[in-house]
Structure formats: structure tokens, C-alpha cells
Interface confidence: low
Amino acid sequence: EVEKTACPSGKKAREIDESLIFYKKWELEACVDAALLATQMDRVNAIPFTYEQLDVLKHKLDELYPQGYPESVIQHLGYLFLKMSPEDIRKWNVTSLETLKALLEVNKGHEMSPQVATLIDRFVKGRGQLDKDTLDTLTAFYPGYLCSLSPEELSSVPPSSIWAVRPQDLDTCDPRQLDVLYPKARLAFQNMNGSEYFVKIQSFLGGAPTEDLKALSQQNVSMDLATFMKLRTDAVLPLTVAEVQKLLGPHVEGLKAEERHRPVRDWILRQRQDDLDTLGLGLQG
């Protein structure tokens, strides 16, 4: 808590400018009007304040807005955002995607901090769902964002938003998450033709049921082994040798290298040895 002291004569700040970097903490507290600071927040970022000075500026804003900052101030917080606690951020009502982008930019290149996680949570809850523009923005800054959400949270993602998802955004998703995302992707891409559809749906197939895998096996998709290995074991087990051969196409030879790993191992154990022999790979059921 900074002590209340009178501002020295002639030091009252008329505007937020570089001269303030020479002010001591108590002088900033005494001589900078909080309302002036709020209206000129966009200037703060261009001034090389110390962390201690930024603490004082934050304190002034906290006093001016005890119920939480207005969006006009939030949008221009810049590096002052790094001084905010999750508790501070929970008081905010952030509705503009531009505000979100501005604050994510400040944290760019770092792992998602508790502050950023809270900000995103506030923003998404305020919007009611993860719309395409929001998802585009979040995955651009945090490719793993989608996979950090619970299945319940993912259920609020509209199918139209799935178009924004890139394969790398799903790299760390668990099967439970893909179980939620796959039906949305299927709906989103349903009007595409066979080969284009497969390119788009491929990353989501970890949530696909057996019947959809059977359907894909009839479309000459040539699924690669990396994709096959991510399929649900319970979805792969009912597939016949012929269906897996059609599904993988020329990649079927890769089954040999993966014969000890799920789902291949479990699938092999379900097959008749005679059927496995037709592949000519030396697989032993």
C-alpha cells in the first residue's frame, strides 16, 4: 500500500508522458490522476516504466475501478496486463475480440499463464460459445488450446468453428475430447467430396465409431499408420482384415512395425490366423 502524500509543487501530471519515468513511486501516486491515466492508457506501453512504477499505476486503476476495469482501459493495458492477477481479471467483462488479441499479444511466446487462462475463460463465457473467430484467434496464439478444454467445454463449440481447426491444434487431445469433436467435424465437412473430406476429417478420426471407419474403407482413402494408431481401439476391433487392408491401402505394410502396440495388437488378436495370413506380413494372431 503506497502512502498518501501531497504532490510537490509543479509536478502534477498534465498528461502521461516520458517525464513520469523520473518520478519516484510516491510521486506517481500523488501526482498522476487516475482518471487521466485511464483515458491515456494507450501511452503507458510506449514509456519504459519500471515494474515498481507499473505497480503504482495498477494501484491507481484499482482504486478508480474497484468493481473491475472498463473495456476501454483493458484494451490498452499492454504490459500492465502482466501485473494483473486472475482475481483482478475475474472482475472484467471483455467482449471485444480486439481486446482479447491485444492482451494475448502481450503474453505471446510464453506458456498460457493463469491470467491468460482466466481472461480466455471470461471471454468465452461472455460469448456463450467458442465461435469461429475466437477459436481462430486462440489457436493461433496457443495451438494446444482446444485440447486444454474439457469435453463439457468442447460441447459448446459450434460445428462451423471446426473449419478453423488445424491438425496441430489436436495433437494433444485425449480420446474423450476427440469423441466430442469428431461428430462436429463430421457435420461441418459433410458436403465435401470423398478425398477432400478425408483430408479434413483425418485429424478428428480418434473419435470415429466403427461404422464410419467401415464407410471410409470403401473410399480408397489410404489412411497412414500414424492416423490409424490414434483410432479408438473399440472402433478398430470389429473391423475385418479386408476392411483394414482397404482402409490403409499401401500403408497396410506398416502394421508389422506396430504389431505390439494398440490398437494393432488388440485387433490382431481378434482376427482369424487364416485372414491375417492373406496380408503376407507374418502377423501372428
Partner: nanobody, 125 residues
Framework: EVQLVESGGGLVQPGGSLRLSCAAS????????MGWFRQAPGKGREGVSA????????VYSDSVGGRFTISRDNSKNTVYLQMNSLRAEDTAMYYC??????????????????WGQGTLVTVSS
């Protein structure tokens, strides 16, 4: 009931190697991300490495990248941490964790619901 049991810790000289294991039970191991964390004496717990169920998208902390390797064997319900070129500053209690929470990064200490009891690694000459 979820159980995580770490092993493989011990005393090793600087530059040496150790392989930690974490045996898991009580949950579907093959559908869960697993993380390794450590806590040095008098310091807070920090993320070391984490491996998703697919073994893609593995992450390492800057301090161990290039020296440590995480891996998993879903058939044995076990996750491993191979530690090479060990330094004195790697001395810590090492914990494995699972059951990732939403809204957290893979190396976030608050990102996991279940933890093991830890295994002590001491690097000293």
C-alpha cells in the same frame, strides 16, 4: 482408485544418468496424458516433461530439454523419464502426475489431479 508409484531415483555423479519409472493403475492409462514434475529442496514444484496418450506433442521444460527423454509403454501402464548429463541443479524429488485438468498447460503444476509420492534424485560428487 488411481495409484502412481515412482521408482528409479538415487545418488548419481554429475554427468551421470538415471531412468525413472512411474507405474500407474486404477484408470485407463492409454487415454491419459502423463507428466513428470520435480521439487528441489526449499523450492516450488515445477514441470519437467509431459507426454500425451498418443506420444505426440511431447513437451519439456527449457531446463531439461535435450538431456531428458520422456516415453511411455501403454502395455505396461508405465511412463519413463530418461535423465542424461545430470547436473547438481537437477537434485530434487521427482513426481509423476495424471488426470489433466482443462484450461491448463501440460507443464502446469495445477494441471493434474493425481500425483505419486515421488522418488528422490541426488546429483553430487
Amino acid at each position: 482408485e488411481v495409484q502412481l508409484v515412482e521408482s528409479g531415483g538415487g545418488l548419481v555423479q554429475p554427468g551421470g544418468s538415471l531412468r525413472l519409472s512411474c507405474a500407474a493403475s486404477g484408470f485407463t492409462f492409454s487415454r491419459n496424458t502423463m507428466g513428470w514434475f520435480r521439487q528441489a529442496p526449499g523450492k516450488g514444484r515445477e514441470g519437467v516433461s509431459a507426454i500425451p496418450y498418443t506420444s505426440t506433442g511431447i513437451v519439456y521444460s527449457d531446463s531439461v530439454g535435450g538431456r531428458f527423454t520422456i516415453s511411455r509403454d501403454n502395455s505396461k501402464n508405465t511412463v519413463y523419464l530418461q535423465m542424461n548429463s545430470l547436473r547438481a541443479e537437477d537434485t530434487a524429488m521427482y513426481y509423476c502426475a495424471t488426470d489433466r485438468r482443462p484450461g491448463t498447460t501440460m507443464l502446469a503444476v495445477n494441471g493434474y489431479n493425481h500425483w505419486g509420492q515421488g522418488t528422490l534424485v541426488t546429483v553430487s560428487s
